[in-house]
């Protein structure tokens, strides 16, 4: 049932031992009680005891006190269980009877006689407090108390709310006095069936099946599932969402395994040569005179740099060289002349000028010739005049630079502007960058080419690059990009310090 009407009989007084019909009991009134509980009636009528009925064994003779008894026959208080919502009103009929027969089951005895009866009608709320009453008539007095309480697992004002504490797959809770659920520690939800994950466990990227646990969804890792897992094979890169690989400063390639600062990290160039982060292997060594090889590791012949001047011939020695000078010259490199202008020492149409009162001379060479005697033809490419990887080519008296794609100018010094083709729509401003053109858009437009018209949320079009977080500003058309490490600019479009000439870098 959902509740119990409890009636505690306390004292019955029938001093004269009289029955209701005026006769006296011989030798005394052996008294038992019949109780009938039914729905509220303004005028109590015979008929079924709709809320229940109960009888007692013989409790005493004439006048007696009824003791509390918790089990067996003669239990007191009397229990009238019900299995419905307690309506809050009732009618109660308590009858005292005399039996000449069996003490324990007087109901079944013939010849029972009514001593007295009382009828109570009224309202009664569910609660633990006993309501005490006393009823008198001319011959008898009955003292009693009564209450309505809810059965185990039933709660509320009418014992209509069922709540049974549990700690299993279907819920983890205890019951409050009003029947509402009180979740056990670590559980939440309407039925306390949702675990409370480890504090800080990412709401979207983590979950749990029991309290204080944090299980990561695919693509996430870490104690709180707030670290993305980069693309498999990503070497020197990070991610802002799973399976990305965004290269760290100084690294390139799809898997960030190409060293853009190879020169700094590995020092591959030997013998004082210069290293630049360019070329098919990511670096190029420019050798000092006297060295060759990919890493300038090979020493050339000491004569390879042509140290002997004025037509002197060079001879290699163990750690040095020796110049054999032609007639009229002397010195370590045949740099000193014993000739004068009278000896016509200037070749290729060079003009001779006397010096030191005619004891020596100097040649003024025509275009395309050099050397102290104008004996060498000028190689106009020796000074490496072509910038940005351009190839130098000798063309008769002049030289030309053959530029790599994206460069122009006499010395390939000019970057061909990607902005020349006006890629920015709606009046956007174009900026030439190492990675290509970037547009700064006017208010109301966004996108890499300012092609997206902003209607509501300025962040909706994803104006921030390189994994940056977008925040809308003071008005709908404003936004602010919060750049990840390694990027700057109003849209985080500029990589910080990107080396310009490595093959992986456009």
């Amino acid at each position: 049932g959902s509740g119990i009407f409890q009636l505690r009989l306390q004292e019955f007084v029938n001093q004269r031992g009289m029955l209701a019909n005026g006769q006296s009991c011989e030798p005394g009134c052996r008294t038992f009680f019949r109780i009938c509980l039914k729905h509220f009636q303004a005028t109590f009528s015979e008929g079924p005891c709709t809320f229940g009925n109960v009888s007692t064994p013989v409790l005493g003779t004439n006048s007696f006190v009824v003791r509390d008894k918790n089990s067996g026959s003669g239990r007191n208080p009397l229990q009238l269980p019900f299995n419905f919502t307690w309506p809050g009103t009732f009618s109660l009929n308590i009858q005292a009877w005399h039996t000449p027969g069996d003490d324990l089951r007087p109901e079944t005895s013939p010849g029972n006689s009514l001593i007295s009866q009382i009828i109570i009608q009224g309202s009664l709320a569910v609660g633990k407090i006993w309501r005490t009453d006393e009823q008198n008539d001319t011959l008898t007095r009955l003292s009693y108390s009564y209450r309505v309480i809810c059965s185990d697992n039933y709660y509320g004002e009418s014992c209509s709310r069922l709540c049974k504490k549990r700690d299993d797959h279907f819920g983890h809770y205890e019951c409050q006095p009003d029947g509402s659920l009180s979740c056990l520690p670590g559980w939440t939800g309407k039925y306390c069936d949702q675990p409370i994950c480890l504090s800080g466990c990412h709401e979207q990227n983590g979950y749990c099946s029991k309290p204080d646990e944090c299980i990561c969804r695919p693509g996430w890792q870490g104690r709180l599932c707030n670290e993305c897992i980069p693309h498999n094979g990503c070497r020197h890169g990070t991610c802002s969402i799973p399976w990305q690989c965004a290269c760290d400063e100084g690294w390139g390639g799809l898997f960030c395994d190409q060293d853009l600062n190879y020169c700094t990290h590995h020092s591959p160039c030997k013998n004082g040569s210069t290293c630049s982060n360019s070329g098919p292997k990511g670096y190029t060594c420019t050798c000092l005179p006297g060295y060759t090889g990919e890493h300038c590791e090979l020493g050339l012949s000491k004569c390879a740099s042509n140290p002997c001047r004025n037509g002197g011939s060079c001879k290699d020695q163990e750690n040095s060289y020796h110049c054999l000078c032609p007639p009229g010259y002397y010195g370590q490199h045949c740099e000193h002349s014993t000739l004068t202008c009278a000896d016509s020492p200037c070749f290729n149409g060079g003009s001779c000028r006397e010096r030191n009162q005619g004891s020596s001379y100097a040649c003024e060479c025509p275009p395309n010739f050099t050397g102290s005697n104008c004996e060498k033809k000028v190689d106009r490419c020796t000074s490496n005049p072509c910038a940005n990887g351009g190839q130098c080519q000798n063309r008769g008296p002049s030289r030309t630079c053959r530029c790599r794609p994206g460069f122009t100018g006499t010395h390939c010094e000019l970057h061909i502007s990607d902005c020349a083709r006006s890629p920015c729509a709606h009046g956007g401003t174009c900026h030439d960058l190492e990675n290509g053109p970037v547009c700064t858009c006017p208010a109301g437009f966004s996108g890499r080419r300012c092609e997206v018209r902003i209607t509501h949320d300025a962040c909706a079009s994803g104006p921030c690059f390189n994994g940056a977080t977008c925040y809308t500003g003071l008005s709908p058309n404003n936004f602010v990009c919060n750049c990840p490490y390694g990027f700057v600019g109003s849209r985080c479009e500029f990589p910080v310090g990107l080396p310009p000439s490595f093959p992986w870098v456009a």
Epitope: C247, G253, L254, P405, W504, A506
Partner: nanobody
Framework: EVQLVESGGGLVQPGGSLRLSCAAS????????IGWFRQAPGKEPEGISC????????YYADSVKGRFTISRDNAKNTVYLQMNSLKPEDTAVYYC?????????????TGQGTQVTVSS
């Protein structure tokens, strides 16, 4: 939504050729570098080639240099990988990828892949 769809894979004999295509959509194609990487069963992925947004700078892994050629057709929003002199060790799933920037520096978006099997 950025999409990269690979096609052109299949079964080929050693020494044969294949041409893979990567059709791109959902972004301004000529703003982004595009590359190819491959993954054989039980092995780490290997970046094999990449072409910058302008098409002026290309990269090849040593294992494919001289045999594979990458190119792009900005008008068709497509990148191609011409694979010649194929070897059994070229067998893998080939993926198209972009770093989401003009230079070949990382992976942001990846296609579903196309299987290439080199076997006699």
């Amino acid at each position: 939504e950025v999409q990269l769809v690979e096609s052109g894979g299949g079964l080929v004999q050693p020494g044969g050729s294949l041409r893979l295509s990567c059709a791109a959509s959902g972004f301004t194609f000529d703003d982004y570098a595009i590359g190819w990487f491959r993954q054989a069963p039980g092995k780490e992925p290997e970046g094999i080639s990449c072409i910058s947004s302008s098409g002026g700078i290309t990269y090849y892994a040593d294992s494919v240099k001289g045999r594979f050629t990458i190119s792009r057709d900005n008008a068709k929003n497509t990148v191609y990988l011409q694979m010649n002199s194929l070897k059994p060790e070229d067998t893998a799933v080939y993926y198209c990828a972009t770093p989401g920037i003009a230079a070949c520096r990382g992976i942001h978006y990846t296609g579903q892949g196309t299987q290439v099997t080199v076997s006699s």
